[in-house]
Amino acid sequence: AILGRSETQECLFFNANWERDRTNQTGVEPCYGDKDKRRHCFATWKNISGSIEIVKQGCWLDDINCYDRTDCIEKKDSPEVYFCCCEGNMCNEKFSYFPEMEVTQPTSNPVTPKPP
């Protein structure tokens, strides 16, 4: 491991469509990938009228959008499906939404997912 960088070896796994996709619903996912590349964790969720619905969580392959992010934070303004990624084992257990707005002050909506 390179000093100062969290190496990701496993992530929290969740799949809302586990029956259709023929996977487990929840668990811990070991992260595989080319040895020369970085690995990350991700979380995706929807905000349905203020209610958080997790779509998927798991491992994510080498992506500069995720480099050196210890927390899983979505910064896009009002996406249809929220997505965040991070580095470090199980870093996708918690995820947040901090939209980067140009003029107004950013609002914080931290989310601690509860298993269904």
């Epitope: 595989y32 080319d34 995706t44 798991g58 392959l61 080498d62 992506d63 500069i64 959008n65 499906v81």
Partner: antibody, heavy 115, light 111 residues
Framework: QVQLVQSGAEVKKPGSSVKVSCKAS????????INWVRQAPGQGLEWMGT????????SYAQKFQGRVTITADTSTSTAYMELSSLRSEDTAVYYC????????WGQGTLVTVSS | QSALTQPRSVSGSPGQSVTISCTGT?????????VNWYQQHPGKAPKLMIY???KRPRGVPDRFSGSKSGNTASLTISGLQAEDEADYYC???????????FGGGTKLTVL
């Protein structure tokens, strides 16, 4: 091993649409982006757009905005690129590639637009 | 994003070294370590040779190396071999908040 297998060659009339598929295997489809790139005969590579298969979020090159639609079906590990209002200049080989680094590529799909 | 600028062609004899340049702007090549290099033989799909300016994927010979200075990235091929004759493209990372762009390509001829 990682493989991206694309659909076969297509011949299309000007003004019509084409939909090219890219089936991924050998890795978890929901763990990276799929990018689409095209190459006209004797020309260079041209980036068309990308999709995050997990969120469905897409980004398109300005040149193709409004004419290209990239989708992904996680249940079959397949990405699709649909290009509409075809013209002769769209005759090209269309490639899908895995991840932001384009580390694995499909074999390419030749789309010929001719009246 | 405008295309990255590459020389149309370069050439070298077997055993020699050649360098292919890829010039962008301070907002793309100059700002980030996200330039990649691809090799394409006629009628084949491109192959990733260098990513993140200087990282080499598994299976790529160490004769291929990448570097960057200012707004220009470079691919150096040392100990040139006949099979290195191909088109080479530079390109950027694409995904999330990053949009992709490629150079126009450089034809490498091994004399």
């Amino acid at each position: 091993q990682v493989q991206l297998v694309q659909s076969g060659a297509e011949v299309k009339k000007p003004g019509s649409s084409v939909k090219v598929s890219c089936k991924a295997s050998g890795y978890k489809f929901t763990s990276s982006y799929i990018n689409w790139v095209r190459q006209a005969p004797g020309q260079g590579l041209e980036w068309m757009g990308t999709i995050n298969p997990v969120s469905g979020s897409t980004s398109y090159a300005q040149k193709f905005q409004g004419r290209v639609t990239i989708t992904a079906d996680t249940s079959t590990s397949t990405a699709y690129m649909e290009l509409s209002s075809l013209r002769s200049e769209d005759t090209a080989v269309y490639y899908c590639a895995r991840g932001g680094w384009f580390d694995y590529w499909g074999q390419g799909t030749l789309v010929t637009v001719s009246s | 994003q405008s295309a990255l600028t590459q020389p149309r062609s370069v050439s070298g004899s077997p055993g020699q070294s050649v360098t292919i340049s890829c010039t962008g702007t301070s907002s793309d090549v100059g700002s980030y370590n996200y330039v990649n290099w691809y090799q394409q033989h006629p009628g084949k799909a491109p192959k990733l040779m260098i990513y993140g300016v200087s990282k080499r994927p598994r299976g790529v010979p160490d004769r291929f190396s990448g570097s960057k200075s200012g707004n220009t990235a470079s691919l150096t091929i040392s100990g040139l071999q006949a099979e290195d004759e191909a088109d080479y493209y530079c390109g950027t990372f694409a995904g999330g908040s990053y949009y992709g762009v490629f150079g126009g390509g450089t034809k490498l001829t091994v004399l």
